[in-house]
């Protein structure tokens, strides 16, 4: 016999029992020990690991008057709402002196109706577009066989015969419901019912039909929408900030978009009140009674240049002998494009008109022939862009120069001998 046989004596006089039940069950495991002296703390093990946060209670009853007499210690472990993670081998553990004692094991098992780990979820899908639904259940007891239902109609002849964890749906043309049944030896559990809402497909081939400086006409091809007719389409346009800031896949524009609705058919829309010569991004989505399609990618477009909407401002023309000094300011009205320059025309009472391209300068000195003999000379100025000339200013008569008036020195321009152009409104 080994020396110090007291070391082998287990203090446990009652060991944990066994619990087997369905999920959600509440049960209690109990162990009892008899020790001499100060009662120890009872720990619970599951599969050999100390349960740090066990819901346990410990009761201690002295069997004598002296603290060195024996004590009965009872520990109860409460398992509330039994789950699969609770299953395993349970033991009590105490440290007595320099020794560790572990009780005989009890076992907690789970057995009942199938339990869903994953159920089909509500979702939206584009019409006629394939998608997958997931359903996963477990026992015990195993095996667990699944049966999928669409609009309450089974999709297989028997559980386990059709698709199991993943159901592949090749496409729908109407909003439908899906659920799955899990079958095991204990019975059947039905999952939640998922509603799959059929939305229109994303429109295709968004493109420009025509362009004006302040409007764009766009068209697109609608996607399939199942049994639900399209009610309208929505077009959004946003300033592109020189094409920066909006990438094809970016979900939202950087600022509030201009939104327009189009009745359908036709799948076409004229977007007005735009800025000329400006880059935009546009996208479109179409809606049925079930909801909107996804947006198309942003399409970069640009309005063309227009002609300036007003004449140059504050034109002054002064004459000093055979020289005329003319200057003006940029039109206050929108240029509708990039200003390329100014055209100037002048004409005497009995002389043909003369047209000149001044470029981007806003003043010019003219060298007149005849040393001032031309009478009633008038000057007109117009701004122009790549799209053409804006409106001409009203004719401005040439005033005689008075001493004290500033007249900067400018490049002198000889009057051409023949007119370059003639205007019908003169």
């Amino acid at each position: 016999a080994p020396r110090g046989t007291q070391a082998e004596e287990s203090p446990f006089v009652g060991n944990p029992g066994n619990i087997t039940g369905a999920r959600g069950l509440t049960g209690t495991l109990r162990c009892q020990l008899q020790v001499q002296g100060e009662p120890p703390e009872v720990h619970w093990l599951r599969d050999g690991q100390i349960l740090e946060l066990a819901d346990s209670t410990q009761t201690q009853v002295p069997l004598g008057e002296d603290e060195q007499d024996d004590w009965i210690v009872v520990s109860q472990l409460r398992i509330t709402s039994l789950q699969l993670s609770d299953t395993g081998q349970y033991q009590c553990l105490v440290f007595l002196g320099h020794q560790t004692f572990v009780s005989q094991p009890g076992y907690v098992g789970l057995e009942g109706l199938p339990y869903f780990l994953e159920e089909p979820e509500d979702r939206t899908v584009a019409a006629n577009t394939p998608f997958n639904l997931s359903c996963q259940a477990q026992g015990p007891p195993e095996p667990v066989d699944l049966l999928w239902l669409q609009d309450a109609v089974p999709l297989a002849t028997a559980p386990g015969h059709g698709p199991q964890r993943s159901l592949h749906v090749p496409g729908l043309n109407k909003t439908s419901s899906f659920s799955c049944e899990a079958h095991n030896a204990k019975g059947v559990t039905t999952s939640r019912t998922a509603t799959i809402t059929v939305l229109p497909q994303q429109p295709r081939n968004l493109h420009l039909v025509s362009r004006q400086p302040t409007e764009l006409e766009v068209a697109w091809t609608p996607g399939l929408s199942g049994i639900y007719p399209l009610t309208h389409c929505t077009l959004q346009a946003v300033l592109s900030d020189d094409g920066m800031g909006i990438q094809a896949g970016e979900p939202d524009p950087p600022e509030e978009p201009l939104t327009s609705q189009a009745s359908v058919p036709p799948h076409q829309l004229r977007l007005g009140s735009l800025h000329p010569h400006t880059p935009y991004h546009i996208r479109v989505a179409c809606t049925s009674s079930q909801g909107p399609s996804s947006w198309t990618h942003w399409l970069p477009v640009e309005t063309p240049e227009g002609v300036p909407l007003g004449p140059p401002e504050n034109i002054s023309a002064t004459r000093n002998g055979s020289q005329a000094f003319v200057h003006w300011q940029e039109p206050r009205a929108p240029l509708q494009g990039t200003l390329l320059g100014y055209r100037l025309a002048y004409q005497g009472q009995d002389t043909p008109e003369v047209l000149m391209d001044i470029g981007l300068r806003q003043e010019v000195t003219l060298e007149l022939q005849g040393d001032g003999s031309v009478s009633n000379l008038t000057v007109c100025v117009a701004a122009y862009t790549a799209a053409g000339d804006g409106p001409w200013s009203l004719p401005v008569p040439l005033e005689a120069w008075r001493p004290g008036q500033a007249q900067p020195v400018h490049q002198l321009v000889k009057e051409p001998s023949t007119p370059a152009f003639s205007w019908p409104w003169w």
Epitope: G4, Q6, A7, Q68, G97, T100, V102
Partner: antibody, heavy 118, light 108 residues
């Protein structure tokens, strides 16, 4: 049968480190604490402390805090005593012992003689 | 810490004599936690009596232990030559565990 077998005698210089092993067999290692006892030449027994083999938690007597360390290799059912920065007064025989519920030491290793000499 | 004082430090007896050695504690010890060890020269100590009066496995019946509180004793009813050894008492009343300084028994 239950056995505690210690590593062989050690000759060390002051300032060095020694690690003594205590390999157990014949019982469940994690169910009994391992105690360490020092016996200086011609002297009595001195309890150094113990290690809970289930939790791996060491406890040291006041005179053995600092340079002394108890450790385990549970998979090999082996306990270790390490002494750092050896001093002359560490020269002794060191015993590992198995602790019981009544704090008695029911099995002892054969002892490891440590000589500290410059 | 609880200091254990053993007396006598050395004792001599002839075979067949009864001997008693004592162990006094500086504070009270539970009888469950007072133990005796035998150590022969050059050997490891052996658990001899545990929990005051229980003989460890293989210990001859001529050995007995008794006591309570702060006073404990080990008695050999009829000493034999093989009993020559040093006997240590050992207690636990909270860390640290302590040993007595030993009683050396010589057999004539």
């Amino acid at each position: 049968q239950i056995q505690l077998v210690q590593s062989g005698p050690e000759l060390k210089k002051p300032g060095e480190t020694v690690k003594i092993s205590c390999k157990t067999s014949g019982y469940t290692f994690t169910y009994y604490g391992i105690n360490w006892v020092k016996q200086a030449p011609g002297k009595g027994l001195e309890w150094m402390g113990w290690i809970n083999t289930y939790l791996g938690e060491p406890t040291y007597a006041d005179d053995f805090k600092g340079r002394f360390a108890f450790s385990l290799e549970t998979s090999a059912s082996t306990a270790y005593l390490q002494i750092n920065n050896l001093r002359d007064e560490d020269m002794a025989t060191y015993f590992c012992t198995r602790g019981t519920m009544s704090y008695s030491f029911d099995y002892w290793g054969q002892g490891t003689a440590l000589t500290v000499s410059s | 810490q609880n200091v254990l004082t053993q007396s006598p430090a050395i004792m001599s007896a002839s075979p067949g004599e009864e001997v008693t050695m004592t162990c006094r504690a500086s504070s009270s010890v539970s009888s469950s936690y007072l133990h005796w060890y035998q150590q022969k020269s050059g050997a490891s100590p052996k658990l001899w009596i545990y929990s005051t009066s229980k003989l460890a496995s293989g210990v001859p019946a001529r050995f007995s232990g008794s006591g309570s509180g702060t006073s404990y004793s080990l008695t050999i009813s009829s000493v034999e030559a093989e009993d020559a050894a040093t006997y240590y008492c050992h207690q636990y009343s909270g860390d640290p565990l302590t040993f007595g300084s030993g009683t050396k028994l010589e057999v004539k």
